[in-house]
Interface confidence: low
């Protein structure tokens, strides 16, 4: 066992104990966690849709407010959204969130004040003449401006109905446009009002179709399991080849997911990075972190992938039958 | 102003960098777009460096071309270069999130693929 | 994000009017991210309208953008011989996964 473990390790498997590197080789079906885990977990935003009154609602004051929302998240479309914000505004100071809640695998509400200062201190529009910028080269802050509050609703399809709103059917379709290519797309509202569309994508990683490809032939079933909606998670299902797809788990359910399988008699293994998944890598019979991932992720697993590289799992696995054959 | 340079002769499978030089403006507060145009074509977008240097491309370049930037100049780097790269290579500047057009542009350098 | 422009050539006669049209799908960012250039033999583009109708400095008056969403026209009344040129529109280009420009429309003056 010492030998296995260390040969792990040499190899940037670190396995803790004998148990797990025992389990290893038992196991008959591996669930993977979509975000961080089979993608890079470094979501990009490729399109900001302006649903509502651009005249009320300009792109550069829903950027303001929703980057000031999202600077409250800790999930990475959220980081994902606040970035190219304040890319895109060309600041990194945000106005103030209150009153933030965010609810897992639905989305976050907050009240959002004092954006007026970004605005202010926005690039030159191109028909502003340069004699009006002041010394930082911005245009001045329009006069006895009243600060406003918004109330902000960023999330998925059904948060923004369960806050009582209706959902065209062309705007659903634009979000299928972007889950159909495996991207994620979240619908913003500001004060009652649906105004914006948000289409993020997170690359899958290289290695990922091998490491499904070489688990299915060695016997073991693979399963994704993600937060997202079926459409985007079959997309990225398809691209890497798996055929179980669990989608729209909320993380408090990716438990249940794992004993469900555990309850057929299998022995599951997870892998994930711990946003959202520590719970679930603690009940697998085998857990498996990302070595990118969370304190705690590494603290619940079993296994932890120093080199974050999937084919990893494969070779764990591998090296238990291997270890188990030796101890016999 | 912009300015391109770097444009020459290249042999197929070959790799070259053309230069955009910027005066009289900030990259910090600009994106500055690459554009093409093969002889008697239309114009064709090849990506964008942003303010803070995240760089987007279109979905054909295929890591074959890559955009990095300095304080006052954004590099084009293409490698495995084919016949079909032989074109005007222009950088344009863009606004930020509250308008996206090209407002400056550069007055383009040529690159040719030929053996 | 695909722009298509029609028609191409046009032809017009000096004081005439010239209609070039150019379609997004889908539709473009904020609904008004569009812009118009026009290009001489052997020039670099030059900005006409941006922001669908907003003129650009230094552009005659004559030139005139309209449009919202999906669909999007470029006037040239009153035209000139200097207006014998290749326009072309163009969306935004961070939110562009193919081109962001039109494929051009050649206006002939006679």
């Known amino acids: 066992v010492m030998v296995g473990t260390g040969v792990a390790a040499q190899n940037g498997i670190l396995i803790k104990g004998g148990k797990p590197l025992e389990m290893a080789h038992k196991i008959k079906t591996v669930m993977f966690d979509k975000t961080g885990t089979i993608t890079h977990g470094v979501p990009r935003v490729m399109r900001v849709l302006l649903l509502g009154d651009v005249a009320t609602l300009p792109l550069r004051k829903v950027l303001a407010v929703v980057g000031t929302a999202e600077a409250s998240s800790e999930h990475p479309l959220g980081v994902a959204v606040t970035k190219y914000c304040k890319e895109e505004l060309g600041t990194e100071t945000l106005g103030y969130c209150t009153d933030f809640q965010a609810v897992p695998g639905c989305g976050i509400g907050c009240k959002v004040s004092n954006v007026e200062g970004i605005l202010a201190h926005s690039e030159r529009p191109l028909s502003a003449p340069a004699s009006h910028l002041n010394e930082a080269g911005s245009l001045p802050a329009e006069k006895d401006a009243v600060p406003q509050t918004f109330s902000v609703l960023i999330g998925n399809r059904e948060w923004l109905r369960r806050n009582g709103l209706t959902i065209s059917s062309d705007v659903s379709d634009a979000m299928t446009d972007h889950e159909m290519k495996g991207q994620t797309a979240i619908l913003v509202a500001i004060d009652g009002v649906l105004c914006g569309m948000i289409a993020i994508a997170d690359a899958v990683k290289q290695e990922a179709a091998l490491a499904v490809h070489t688990l299915q032939s060695m016997g073991v079933d693979v399963v994704l399991i993600t937060g997202d909606n079926r459409k985007t998670a079959r997309a990225i299902a398809t691209q890497v080849g798996i055929n179980k797809v669990f989608a729209e788990v909320l993380p408090s359910h990716k438990v249940a997911k794992v004993q469900e399988l555990q309850n057929k008699g299998k022995k599951v293994a997870m892998v994930g990075d711990g946003v959202n998944d520590s719970p679930a890598l603690a009940q697998a019979d085998m857990g498996v972190a990302i070595g990118t991932g969370t304190d705690v992720a590494i603290e619940a697993a079993d296994v932890v992938l120093i080199r974050n590289d999937l084919l990893d799992v494969v070779a764990s696995i591998h090296l238990s039958k291997r270890t188990v054959r030796r101890i016999r | 102003s912009l300015e391109e340079s770097g444009g020459r002769l290249v042999t197929p499978g070959g790799s070259l960098t053309v230069t955009c030089t910027v005066s009289g403006f900030s990259l910090s507060s600009y994106w500055i777009i690459w554009v093409r145009q093969a002889p008697g074509e239309g114009l064709e977008w090849i990506g964008s460096s942003g303010p803070s240097g995240s760089a987007y491309y279109t979905s054909w370049v295929k890591g074959r071309f890559t955009i990095s930037k300095t304080s006052t100049t954004v590099d084009l780097k293409m490698t495995g270069l084919t016949t079909e790269d032989t074109a005007t290579y222009f950088c344009a500047r863009a606004g930020g999130s509250d308008y996206d057009w090209f407002d400056l542009w550069g007055q383009g350098t040529l690159v040719t693929v030929s053996s | 994000q695909v722009l298509t422009q029609t028609p191409s050539p046009v032809s017009a006669a000096v004081g005439g009017t010239v209609t070039i049209n150019c379609q997004s799908s889908?539709?473009?960012?904020?609904?008004?991210?569009l812009s118009w250039f026009q290009q001489k033999p052997g020039q670099r583009p030059k900005l006409l309208i941006y922001?669908?109708?907003t003129l650009a400095s230094g552009v005659p008056s004559r030139f005139k953008g309209s449009g919202s969403g999906t669909q999007f026209t470029l006037t040239i009344s009153d035209v000139q011989c200097d207006d014998a040129a290749t326009y072309y529109c163009a969306g935004g280009h961070k939110t562009a996964e193919k081109n962001p420009f039109g494929g051009g429309t050649e206006v002939v003056v006679k």
């Open positions: 889908p539709s473009v960012a904020n609904n008004n991210w």
């Open positions: 922001g669908a109708s």
